[in-house]
């Protein structure tokens, strides 16, 4: 177990042309805020994807008001690190996502405004326990300076923070065959408990006798580089040889999750949902009472005032588990209506909204209907949060206040001359023809190819359409 | 406990005015939304308003819109609805309502026992 | 507006039955349904939420499914404490509406 550190230096305009404008105005006051997003190996999945390895958001910055006339300054940041926590191994490799978003401060409805103002990703290898790194990404016109670390919480040490410490049980020396814990030199490395031949670069264990697997290789002992060469299953160690992936034993096989402790599987382990008054990796302290402070993420925990009765935690909006250790994936309710897109900003959910909608949830389709009139006998139809005015004959235009003229897609069929009148159009017919739109040919004899016209309408006079 | 209690009810003219307060306690009321709903003698509920956790979403059904004002006081935890231009179809016990967390699901979770309006000459 | 109809405006059961009532969005309300209890004191309360979802606190004989525009709440073993009226209320698009109500009591 360890922490990801990411100290944010400074957020600003880029070098060169082009710089932006400031994101923040005398009308409209704003403030930064960051969120990192952290995935195992070198992977370059969509910013969609989710943050495996963890992700953290920033208090928010200073609020900020651009001086008219001057250019964008690098902004002020918020105070503080982004700390991002990993129960398992740090796994060496890693991908990361930072994001520089913007609230907004106006009095606008809809509360505070956020947006995104930039965005960069990297993939980067990085060993726990070494110094910080740093690094400049661009995105657009902005530049982001940052460094980062991982660091491991004691008892973990080593580079992938698998490696335990314990306090020494002599004064002077470690015991046989084991070092002392750098940098803590009164501690020393624990006994190795892991099973024998398990790689010390590639495998750890949490308990004696187990080999477990970093992302990327396989085998009994994690010595089987795994191969992208297709397989025909999808599942555990094959041939020392290939490292191609066949089926064998799943991380919960066997139920590692011991007093009744229910085990699911994980992209890269597997978790335990522990039965109350149970915790830890696999269930296996217990005896715990509020005292022991076993409720999670800031829940409130209830009873167990002596080992004997059970503890309840009641979980802050956002997580649930009998510990409050999991987060709810609030956007998988899809809470965004009308097809709006979904965002967990971690301290908020926000909803992008399809035009047409509006409202924290896009659940106020902009019925433009209501209060507004189509001139001139105009209907106005609805549909999917827009408007469009069904106008009557001689009117057009959005709101049916312009008057149409009929004549301008040339209804007038064989040459015929088109006037317009106020109750619609009038065609004067060519010679040889006749009708409404001059649509019907006059035959040689003057009958026409229609019963006769109606009396007193010769053929060749206008005809009115109404 | 989640508690919400209403008041300010009473009997009053038409075009007259009334002012109904809700005190929420049990729970951070500052992070919840809160929802008006009456309900007619011998009627359905019919939704009024709705005001966000920090105030700044405010919805008001068509029939009282431009009439009824919904407020509220974070500092006191105090819900207010203030209603004016009465009418007889606004006699209703009037009800105030929790959303719920994130107004994910525009539930009413939690409602108080109600306070009734009647409007009449 | 989304208008919600309770077809079933009075209903009587026995003790154990199994009870459902209907409620019918007029257009798709993709599953942001809310069933409520009115007990005949005016005390109001959420059973469901989300179409299918049990509120803290309710009784696992009640349950609620349904999709599109169709939605059901079941009370799979009926006690009479459920003597009460039943409402639902759809929370997809503005403004927020119930359906008539359907009221349950015991034969």
């Known amino acids: 177990a360890g922490v990801f550190e990411l100290q944010i230096h400074s957020f600003g305009p880029g070098p060169g042309p082009g710089a932006p404008r400031s994101p923040c105005s005398a009308r409209l006051p704003c403030r930064l805020f960051f969120r990192v997003c952290l995935k195992p190996g070198l992977s370059e999945e969509a910013a969609e994807s989710p943050c495996a390895l963890g992700a953290a958001l920033s208090a928010r910055g200073p609020v900020y008001t651009e001086q008219p006339g001057a250019p964008a300054p690098d902004l002020p940041l918020p105070d503080g690190l982004l700390q991002v926590p990993f129960r398992d191994a740090w796994p060496g490799t890693f991908s990361f996502i930072i994001e520089t978003w913007r609230e907004e401060l106006g009095d606008q409805i809809g509360g505070p405004a956020w947006s995104l103002l930039a965005r960069v990703a990297g993939r980067r290898r990085l060993a726990a326990g070494g110094p910080w790194a740093r690094d400049i990404q661009r995105a657009g016109a902005w530049e982001l300076r940052f460094s980062y670390r991982a660091r491991c919480e004691p008892p973990a040490v080593g580079t992938a923070c698998t490696r335990l410490c314990r306090p020494r049980s002599a004064p002077s020396r470690c015991g046989p065959g084991l070092r002392p814990c750098a940098p803590l030199e009164d501690e020393c490395e624990a006994p190795l408990v892991c099973r024998a031949g398990c790689s010390p670069e590639h495998g750890f264990c949490e308990q004696p006798g187990e080999c477990r697997c970093l992302e990327g290789w396989t085998g009994p002992l994690c010595t089987v580089p795994v191969s992208t060469s297709s397989c025909l299953s999808p599942r555990g160690p094959s041939s020392a040889t290939t490292g191609c992936l066949v089926p064998g034993p799943g991380p919960c096989d066997g139920n590692p999750c011991a007093n009744g402790g229910s085990c699911s599987e994980t992209p890269r382990s597997f978790e335990c949902t522990c039965p109350r008054g149970f915790y830890g990796l696999r269930c296996e302290v217990s005896g715990v009472t509020c005292a022991d402070g076993p409720c999670f993420n800031g829940g409130l925990c209830v009873g167990g005032a002596d080992p004997d009765s059970a503890y309840i935690c009641h979980c802050p909006p956002g997580f649930q588990g009998s510990n409050c250790e999991k987060r709810v994936d609030r956007c998988s309710l899809q809470p965004c209506r009308n097809g709006g897109l979904c965002l967990d900003l971690g301290h908020a959910l926000r909803c992008r909204c399809r035009a047409g909608f509006a409202g924290p949830r896009c659940e106020h389709d902009l019925d433009d209907c209501a209060g507004r009139a189509c001139a001139n006998g105009g209907t106005c139809v609805e549909g999917g949060g827009a408007h469009r005015c069904s106008c009557a004959l001689g009117f057009g235009g959005r709101d049916c206040r312009e008057r149409a003229d009929p004549c301008a897609a040339r209804p007038c069929a064989h040459g015929g001359r088109c006037y317009a009148h106020f109750s619609g159009l009038v065609c004067a017919c060519a010679p040889g023809y006749m009708g409404a739109r001059c649509e019907f040919p006059v035959h040689p004899d003057g009958a026409s190819a229609l019963p006769a016209a109606p009396p007193g309408l010769r053929p060749g006079d206008p005809q009115r359409y109404l | 406990e989640v508690q919400l209690v209403e008041s300010g009810g009473g009997l009053v003219k038409p075009g007259g005015s009334l002012k109904l307060s809700c005190a929420a306690s049990g729970f951070t009321f500052s992070d919840y939304g809160i929802h008006w709903v009456r309900q007619a003698p011998e009627k359905g509920l019919e939704w009024v308003a709705y005001i966000s956790s920090g105030g700044y979403t405010i919805y008001y059904a068509d029939t009282v819109k431009g009439r009824f004002t919904i407020s509220r006081d974070n500092a006191k935890n105090t819900l207010f609805l203030q209603m004016t231009s009465l009418r007889s179809e606004d006699t209703a016990m009037y009800y105030c309502a929790r959303g719920d967390y994130d107004d994910i699901f525009y539930t009413m979770d939690y409602w108080g026992q109600g306070t009734s309006v009647t409007v009449s000459s | 507006d989304i208008q919600m109809t309770q077809t079933t405006s009075s209903l009587s059961a026995s003790l154990g039955d199994r009870v459902t009532i209907s409620c019918r969005a007029s257009r798709d309300i993709t599953k942001f349904l809310n069933w409520y209890q009115q007990k005949p004191d005016g005390t109001v309360k959420l059973l469901i939420y989300?179409?299918?979802r049990l509120h803290s606190g309710v009784p696992s004989r009640f349950s609620g499914s349904g999709s599109g525009t169709d939605y059901s709440l079941t009370i799979s073993n009926l006690d009479q404490e459920d003597i009460a009226t039943y409402f639902c209320q759809q929370g997809n698009t503005l403004p927020w509406t119930f359906g008539g109500g359907t009221k349950l009591d015991i034969k």
């Open positions: 989300y179409t299918s």
